[in-house]
């Protein structure tokens, strides 16, 4: 627009000024005036601003508190805040990452879908027919039933989608 | 303290191109619009365009559309003009000046509040 | 494009004299004018923006008014530093353009 409607994308009014915001990893020492710029000072160590602002404290990084499962992904800068995530076998209870529960898993019956990473759970899936798991575990994708026939074998006992077939030898013609 | 400093003297030849640098201190560069103005000797202010320094999004005069090209590089704090296909009437002093806007009355109002030294462009056989 | 028309385009005074700088637009700009002022081989310096407001630092003796299409720049009591060139330019309309100039000469 002609002539502006507005301060510029990275300005503030302020007392009848455009004042320029700070630029991320500082924050505002004082609002600029009709004779003075923008006065603004970088954050300190463990401190950071992500965004171009007018705040007059920088936040905090992220503690990453190992007694809660986590541990540093990628270290903050003064424009960036601390990422955290779980230890291994562990994962987020939340999108902020604040806490870590036990990756579930799957019960007999059961397999994984998806292995669990940092930040999800383990998804399960009942096994379907043909397939089975026997154990409880975060890991295991439920497996095939043993095919009996190219053992030469047949079924003696049907599988379910806990355990699997048993085979056995064919019974012999009699004469 | 706010200072635009611009480069040298310039002297080219028609049909050339020059890019004039403008160096910025004393602010926070990508804050405030910056426009490009020059003057033919002995003559007025001309007003060329302006650049958002944050964006190097240009905007420009229709008279110097597709021989102007405003840019910028934010990690050095310094905004560019390049005009080609030089011509003797593109003899002139080229200004960068940045924009403050005061707001009253409702209503937001541009000048600007500070000038680079200017660069002399002559363009001569 | 708006046309700034200044006049005189040329002006001799002495030390001391209350001078008075036109501008007129081609068209209606409201408040939308700044005036500059301009020595030999030196860049230009803002006097006045929003047609009567003072750039800090500037001396009082500058004042500016108007709107729409008629400005007007005063020098209440000329000094020696003031002998230069006064441009008024608009800002409301692209290009934003400048008037031709004024230039303040001793008499």
């Known amino acids: 627009p002609e002539p502006p409607t507005a301060c510029r994308e990275k300005q503030y009014l302020i007392n009848s000024q455009c004042c320029s915001l700070c630029q991320p990893g500082q924050k505002l020492v004082s609002d600029c005036t009709e004779f003075t710029e923008t006065e603004c000072l970088p954050c300190g160590e463990s401190e950071f601003l992500d965004t171009w602002n007018r705040e007059t404290h920088c936040h905090q990084h992220k503690y990453c508190d190992p007694n809660l499962g986590l541990r540093v992904q990628q270290k903050g800068t003064s424009e960036t805040d601390t990422i955290c995530t779980c230890e291994e076998g562990w994962h987020c209870t939340s999108e902020a990452c604040e806490s870590c529960v036990l990756h579930r898993s799957c019960s007999p019956g059961f397999g994984v879908k998806q292995i669990a990473t940092g930040v999800s759970d383990t998804i399960c899936e009942p096994c379907p027919v043909g397939f089975f798991s026997n154990v409880s575990s975060a890991f295991e994708k439920c497996h095939p039933w043993t095919s009996c026939e190219t053992k030469d074998l047949v079924v003696q006992q049907a599988g379910t989608n806990k355990t699997d077939v048993v085979c056995g030898p064919q019974d012999r013609l009699r004469a | 303290q706010v200072q635009l400093v611009q480069s040298g003297a310039e002297v080219k030849k028609p049909g050339a191109s020059v890019k004039v640098s403008c160096k910025a201190s004393?602010?926070?560069?990508?804050?405030?619009?910056m426009y490009w103005v020059r003057q033919a000797p002995g003559q007025g202010l001309e007003w060329m365009g302006w650049i958002n320094p944050d964006s190097g999004a240009p905007t420009y005069a229709q008279k110097f559309q597709g021989r102007v090209t405003m840019t910028r590089d934010t990690s050095i704090s310094t905004a560019y003009m390049e005009l080609s296909r030089l011509r003797s009437d593109d003899t002139a002093v080229y200004y960068c000046?940045?924009?403050?806007?005061?707001?009253?009355?409702?209503?937001?109002?541009?000048?600007?509040?500070?000038w680079g030294q200017g660069t002399l462009v002559t363009v001569s056989s | 494009d708006i046309q700034l028309t200044q006049s005189p385009s040329f002006l001799s005074a002495s030390v001391g004299d209350r001078v008075t700088i036109t501008c007129r637009a081609s068209q209606g700009i409201s408040s939308y004018l700044a005036w500059y002022q301009q020595k030999p081989g030196k860049a230009p310096k803002l006097l006045i923006y929003?047609?009567?407001t003072l750039q800090s630092g500037v001396p009082s003796r500058f004042s500016g008014s108007g709107s729409g299409t008629e400005f007007t720049l005063t020098i209440s009591s000329l000094q020696p530093e003031d002998f230069a060139t006064y441009y008024c330019q608009q800002l409301t309309s692209y290009p934003w353009t400048f008037g031709q100039g004024t230039k303040v000469e001793i008499k």
């Open positions: 000046a940045r924009e403050k806007i005061y707001y009253g009355s409702g209503n937001y109002y541009p000048s600007f509040d500070y």
């Open positions: 004393g602010y926070t560069f990508a804050g405030y619009y």
């Open positions: 929003a047609a009567s």
